[in-house]
């Protein structure tokens, strides 16, 4: 693994993809989605220590300023670098339609 | 302002663009950048309450699951939606060069 992918806090503690099992009710979708009834939601969770999966120059700056001024500048945070599309069968005024969402499930993660 | 832009926590508490004055030393750039000597770093800071500047469907999901499982799923976090480019005069082995960085200064912010 690249240096930027080795978590100094211990395995699984740093920014990475997690899967959370959720029902339509959990997601607040019960009133407008018919299928799926449950979703394996992939999302980015974990700490962003120095140099870990830094997305860009901005993330480097943010980390340096966070170390200097931790009360003013937060540490970078773990967010999706890209997404996997997902199709939903959703209720409409007249019935149902299929809609693909490109920004629903995280595919991989980085620190920004 | 749209509902998603009105901060329920009070003015200036939610995710927005902040400017932090930083020297080359602060940024850890003193050994490779000549100019500028100081930077007005724009970055995204602030809380991401429900429905505030949600970047996409994923952010909505994350907030709903955070309310259900706050110990497992973190709230969405405030990150750049886009960047402003910045030019640096940087030291090279033979002298100096000008380099434009597209991902250095946050231009606007959203919650992911």
């Amino acid at each position: 693994a690249r240096n930027g992918d080795r978590c100094p806090l211990g395995p699984g503690r740093c920014c990475r993809l997690h899967t959370v099992h959720a029902s339509l009710e959990d997601l607040g979708w019960a009133d407008w989605v018919l299928s799926p009834r449950e979703v394996q939601v992939t999302m980015c969770i974990g700490a962003c220590p120095s140099q870990f999966r830094e997305a860009n120059m901005h993330a480097q700056i943010k980390m340096n300023l966070h170390r200097l001024k931790p009360d003013t500048v937060p540490a970078p945070c773990c967010v999706p670098a890209s997404y996997n599309p997902m199709v939903l069968i959703q209720k409409t005024d007249t019935g149902v339609s299929l809609q693909t969402y490109d920004d629903l499930l995280a595919k991989d993660c980085h620190c920004v | 302002a749209r509902n998603g832009d009105r901060c329920p926590l009070g003015p200036g508490r939610c995710c927005r663009l902040h400017t932090v004055h930083a020297s080359l030393e602060d940024l850890g750039w003193a050994d490779w950048v000549l100019s500028p000597r100081e930077v007005q770093v724009t970055m995204c800071i602030g809380a991401c309450p429900s429905q505030f500047r949600e970047a996409n469907m994923h952010a909505q999901i994350k907030m709903n699951l955070h309310r259900l499982k706050p110990d497992t799923v973190p709230a969405p976090c405030c990150v750049p939606a886009s960047y402003n480019p910045m030019v640096l005069i940087q030291k090279t082995d033979t002298g100096v060069s000008l380099q434009t960085y597209d991902d250095l200064l946050a231009k606007d912010c959203h919650c992911v």
Epitope: S35, N84, P85, M86, V87, L98 | -
Partner: antibody, heavy 118, light 107 residues
């Protein structure tokens, strides 16, 4: 615009292997929740579901035919394949592929006709 | 396997009439039933999902109802263009199974 099109040999002899291809456009099998199924219909008769493949490569088969069926996909080329080994005259039918998101076949191909005859 | 029975193989109706096509499941399938229309010489087209939800673009003359084991597709104000076979399908459990179909004839 979603389209699916089946292609096959048209005529086979008993005991031969049937290879069918479903070429589609307008959607991707890398999309979570998306699938493609194969359904057949003997002339003048009802519909019989054969197999289904999902975005995550999960595969389901009709138990009555499972030992003869293999479904696969090439996600990058937008194609799904069905292989039926050891065909018989009872396999004479029109074979359809259909987009099946969450078990709902909302778009169907035009069908390809197979005749099994010695 | 779950058997889907469409008791009527043929139904005859007139333009403007209302007709109901029925489908019975051999065991409880909740509302996990779809309906398809197949016009002569064509491939099937989706009409109804989850027993009662019209698929986008389907005229509101088509209405689905039922849950458990008994399901109905109702066509009101029948048009000559509705001449077709109508199939129910359960997707509650594998294998997916279809009814034998009901052919709608226009007098």
């Amino acid at each position: 615009q979603v389209t699916l099109k089946e292609s096959g040999p048209g005529i086979l002899k008993p005991s031969q292997t049937l290879s069918l291809t479903c070429s589609f456009s307008g959607f991707s099998l890398s999309t979570s929740g998306m699938g493609v199924g194969w359904i057949r219909q003997p002339s003048g008769k009802g519909l019989e579901w054969l197999a289904h493949i999902w975005w995550n490569d999960d595969k389901y088969y009709n138990p009555s035919l499972k030992s003869h069926l293999t479904i696969s996909k090439d996600t990058s080329r937008n194609q799904v394949f069905l292989m039926i080994t050891s065909v018989d005259t009872a396999d004479t039918a029109t074979y359809y592929c259909a987009r099946g998101a969450y078990d709902f076949f909302d778009y169907w191909g035009q069908g390809t006709t197979l005749t099994v005859s010695s | 396997d779950i058997v889907m029975t469409q008791a009527q193989n043929f139904m005859s109706t007139s333009v403007g009439d209302r007709v109901s096509v029925t489908c019975k499941a051999s065991q409880n399938v909740d509302t996990n039933v779809a309906w398809y229309q197949q016009k002569p010489g064509q491939s099937p087209k989706a009409l109804i999902y989850s027993a009662s939800y019209r698929y986008s673009g389907v005229p509101d003359r088509f209405t689905g109802s039922g849950s458990g084991t008994d399901f109905t597709l109702t066509i009101s104000n029948v048009q000559s263009d509705d001449l077709a076979d109508y199939f129910c399908q359960q997707y509650n459990t594998y294998p997916y199974t279809f009814g034998g179909g009901t052919k709608l004839e226009i007098k």
